[in-house]
């Protein structure tokens, strides 16, 4: 059977600057040359779009300029990192990647990865 | 709230054409893939075509391909279903719906009737 | 293209019992994108269950859905009546999209 599975890492610990960086990667059940990414927030039972990025194999991967994600791509695995977050941004990311183009269409889900953020402590005044 | 109303069905002959439409309200259309899905009178549900985001990718049931265009104006929160040389066993009712976040049509239209007779 | 098979055909049942719906592939389903919808006489369908297993939002706890693979089963835990219904599974992880035939839930 053809099918398309995504695997991205269980837990990420986000940078104190708010960023958050991960793989995920894609075994492609057929030769794509068009790949949509999405990252989706699953927060109870609701799921929201983070951002997403398509691109032709072989080119990089292009988010809006307005977007909090930024990544690169490499064969069927891409990087991803998502900016600016803070703690109560701590969730499960989810890693959407659909084959579009040739035909026929492949949907594949990751499990997810769970992003832990901690707002960094404001720095004491200090005397000087 | 999140809604999808289509319209433009009706009764038409054999080899005319019809054109369907369904309008988006309450979510962010170009984020979302879209289906027409049929049923025949008294029948099951039947996949008819797909657009994807920003309208570019397409991809049709082999009973349509050829015959119908699926189509989508992001700027009107619109999708449409052009349908060219109808047969009699293409009428049904017609409904738009939503391919949601995780891949399920979430999201479903109450329905158009289309009927092809002479 | 994956062809989908629900058995039986019709059910007929008494409110209050158990049904229990059977939903076949012809190959295995990718990921287990297998949805269940409910549809009601001049109604459009409405998503009761989907991955399987995941309950869409807003539907009772009373619909479940199990199964992996080629085989998937949507369960009525006690029926209401309101559950009395046509139900069709579908396979959305590649295309072309297919729905089973669906399964008549009826009132015995």
């Known amino acids: 059977c053809k099918a398309m599975h995504v695997a991205q890492p269980a837990v990420v610990l986000a940078s104190s600057r708010g960023i958050a960086s991960f793989v995920c990667e894609y075994a492609s059940p057929g030769k794509a040359t068009e790949v949509r990414v999405t990252v989706l927030r699953q927060a109870d039972s609701q799921v929201t779009e983070v951002c997403a990025a398509t691109y032709m194999m072989g080119n990089e991967l292009t988010f809006l300029d307005d977007s909090i994600c930024t990544g690169t791509s490499s064969g069927n695995q891409v990087n991803l990192t998502i900016q600016g977050l803070r703690a109560m941004d701590t969730g499960l990311y989810i890693c959407k990647v659909e084959l579009m183009y040739p035909p026929p269409y492949y949907l594949g889900i990751g499990n997810g990865t769970q992003i832990y953020v901690i707002d960094p402590e404001p720095c004491p005044d200090s005397d000087f | 709230q999140v809604q999808l109303v289509e319209s433009g069905g009706g009764v038409v002959q054999p080899g005319r054409s019809l054109r369907l439409s369904c309008a988006a309200s309450?979510?962010?259309?170009?984020?979302?893939?879209m289906h027409w899905v049929r049923q025949a009178p008294g029948k099951g549900l039947e996949w008819v075509a797909v657009?994807?985001?920003?309208?570019?990718?397409?991809h049709y049931a082999d009973s349509v391909k050829g015959r119908f265009t699926i189509s989508r104006d992001n700027s009107k929160n619109t999708l449409y279903l052009q349908m060219n040389s109808l047969r009699a066993e293409d009428t049904a009712v017609y409904y738009c719906?939503?391919?949601?976040?995780?891949?399920?049509?979430?999201?479903w239209g109450q329905g158009t009737m289309v009927t092809v007779s002479s | 293209e994956i062809v989908l098979t629900q058995s039986p055909g019709t059910l007929s049942l008494s409110p209050g019992e158990r049904a229990t719906l059977s939903c076949r592939a012809s190959q295995s389903v990718s990921s287990n994108f297998l949805a269940w919808y409910q549809q009601k006489p001049g109604q459009a369908p409405r998503l009761l269950i989907y991955g399987a297993s995941s309950r869409a939002t807003g539907i009772p706890d009373r619909f479940s859905g199990s199964g992996s693979g080629t085989d998937f089963t949507l369960t009525i835990s006690r029926l209401e009546p309101e559950d009395f219904a046509v139900y069709y599974c579908?396979?959305?992880?590649?295309?072309?999209?297919?729905f089973g035939q669906g399964t008549k839930v009826e009132i015995k």
């Open positions: 719906a939503r391919s949601g976040s995780l891949g399920a049509f979430d999201i």
């Open positions: 657009i994807w985001y920003d309208g570019r990718n397409k």
């Open positions: 579908q396979q959305y992880g590649t295309s072309p999209w297919t």
């Open positions: 309450g979510f962010i259309f170009s984020s979302y893939g």
